[in-house]
Interface confidence: medium
């Protein structure tokens, strides 16, 4: 069968400015910012855009060792941002895959609201574990807030054309740009 | 049964002030976004305001800082505090749930409480 | 904010027809939109949500389409239950807005 969970969530950073980072940029970021839910993204196949794999590994202590996740659809336009969970983690005997869609949306107050929508691809008969579905909601929140931490003290960060200093990052400085972004993509 | 009950509307003068409650049953209020919807007399609907689930608040400019949305957890209850009433503000106030389901619309409707705002 | 416009704002038609209701946005988004039907001193009730998605309990002969600033309501066979004010809304972006309304009567 086939469970859609939907939920929402608030941001004080702009859409724009939050999906640079949170989508465009996530394999780069998430392991740095938040260390403690992804400690690496690898890109399996693929250039970023629709058909691409990544695999993304969970640090020891938490329930699953890895992920692996489809990027379908990147919306540059409508920041919106659709991948799969193809494998790993909870894909298994009663889990086949679970289709991912998340929207940005702008708010009057120059915030964004971050629509989320989870469809679980069941296997027969088998139903959705709650605890599934509410470990999946916290990592994401997780992540959220760990990204918006990190924007919310490096104000020039993600901002078209602007020098980043990634050292607080363990990287060295890079210009980003509109163009660099378009080759990171994830959730 | 899944289904919201609203209270305290009734005749103010402008200027006045005005509580409305909206009594949620068969699910956790503080689990879904939560909506005020308007609609004055012979007119169409028009949306007041949003509590998400998260606790943040929106308003529409009509009412904004004329009017705040909140929720008592434990009550299992949304409400609307409105102040500075004005004449324009007559209408039929219904709460309505955002679903968790079906992309933000609008899946339970309470039957709605009557303000009327007249000196 | 989106401006939502539906057309027509009002119709008669006869039982068995298909009736069809639209609702432009003054900008373009996709999946967020809703169609609710109200009759006259009740709250209104949801029948299309996400474009095309029917509401459990809601008759098949309701149906929704569109995408971009474009979206349609049909009713493929009018019955006699159908009269009421039929509304589009957006739920993509705050201010939430609906349409004016289309006041279908059964002739």
């Known amino acids: 069968g086939v469970f859609n969970y939907e939920t929402e969530t608030t941001s004080v950073i702009p859409a724009a400015r939050l999906f640079k980072a949170f989508i465009l940029d996530g394999d780069n970021l998430f392991p740095k910012v938040a260390p403690q839910a992804i400690s690496s993204v690898e890109n399996i196949e693929g250039n970023g855009g629709p058909g691409t794999i990544k695999k993304i590994s969970f640090p020891e202590g938490l329930p699953f060792k890895y992920v692996k996740d489809r990027v379908d659809e990147v919306d540059h336009t409508n920041f919106k941002y659709n991948y799969a969970v193809i494998e790993g983690g909870p894909i298994g005997d009663t889990l086949e895959k679970i289709s991912n869609e998340i929207k940005i949306v702008a708010t009057p107050d120059g915030g964004s609201i971050l629509k989320i929508s989870n469809k679980y691809h069941t296997k027969g008969d088998h139903e959705v574990k709650a605890e599934q579905v509410k470990a999946s909601k916290e990592m994401g929140e997780t992540l959220l807030r760990a990204v918006e931490s990190y924007l919310l003290a490096h104000s020039d960060a993600y901002n078209e054309q602007k020098l980043i200093s990634e050292e607080d990052l363990g990287g060295e400085q890079k210009l980003i740009s509109e163009e660099d972004l378009h080759h990171h993509h994830h959730h | 049964e899944v289904q919201l009950v609203e209270s305290g509307g009734g005749l103010v003068q402008p200027g006045g002030s005005l509580r409305l409650s909206c009594a949620a049953s068969?699910?956790?209020?503080?689990?879904?976004?939560m909506s005020w919807v308007r609609q004055a007399p012979g007119e169409g609907l028009e949306w007041v305001s949003v509590?998400?689930?998260?606790?943040?608040?929106y308003y529409s400019d009509s009412v904004k800082g004329r009017f705040t949305i909140s929720r008592h957890n434990s009550k299992n209850t949304l409400y609307l505090q409105m102040n500075s009433l004005r004449t324009e503000d007559t209408a039929v106030y219904y709460c309505?749930?955002?679903?968790?389901?079906?992309?933000?619309?609008?899946?339970?409707w309470g039957q709605g409480t009557m303000v009327t705002v007249s000196s | 904010d989106i401006q939502m416009t539906q057309s027509p704002s009002s119709l008669s038609a006869s039982v068995g027809d298909r009736v069809t209701i639209t609702c432009r946005a003054s900008q373009s988004f996709d999946t967020y939109l809703n169609w609710y039907q109200q009759k006259p001193g009740k709250a209104p009730n949801l029948l299309i949500y996400a474009t095309s998605s029917l509401q459990s309990g809601v008759p098949s002969r309701f149906s929704g389409s569109g995408s971009g600033t474009d979206f349609t309501l049909t009713i493929s066979s009018l019955q006699p239950e159908d009269f009421g004010t039929y509304y589009c809304?957006?739920?993509?972006?705050?201010?939430?807005?609906f349409g004016q309304g289309t006041k279908l009567e059964i002739k």
């Open positions: 509590i998400f689930s998260g606790g943040i608040t």
């Open positions: 809304q957006q739920s993509y972006s705050i201010p939430y807005t």
């Open positions: 309505a749930r955002h679903s968790n389901w079906n992309f933000d619309a609008f899946d339970i």
């Open positions: 068969g699910f956790t209020v503080s689990s879904n976004s």
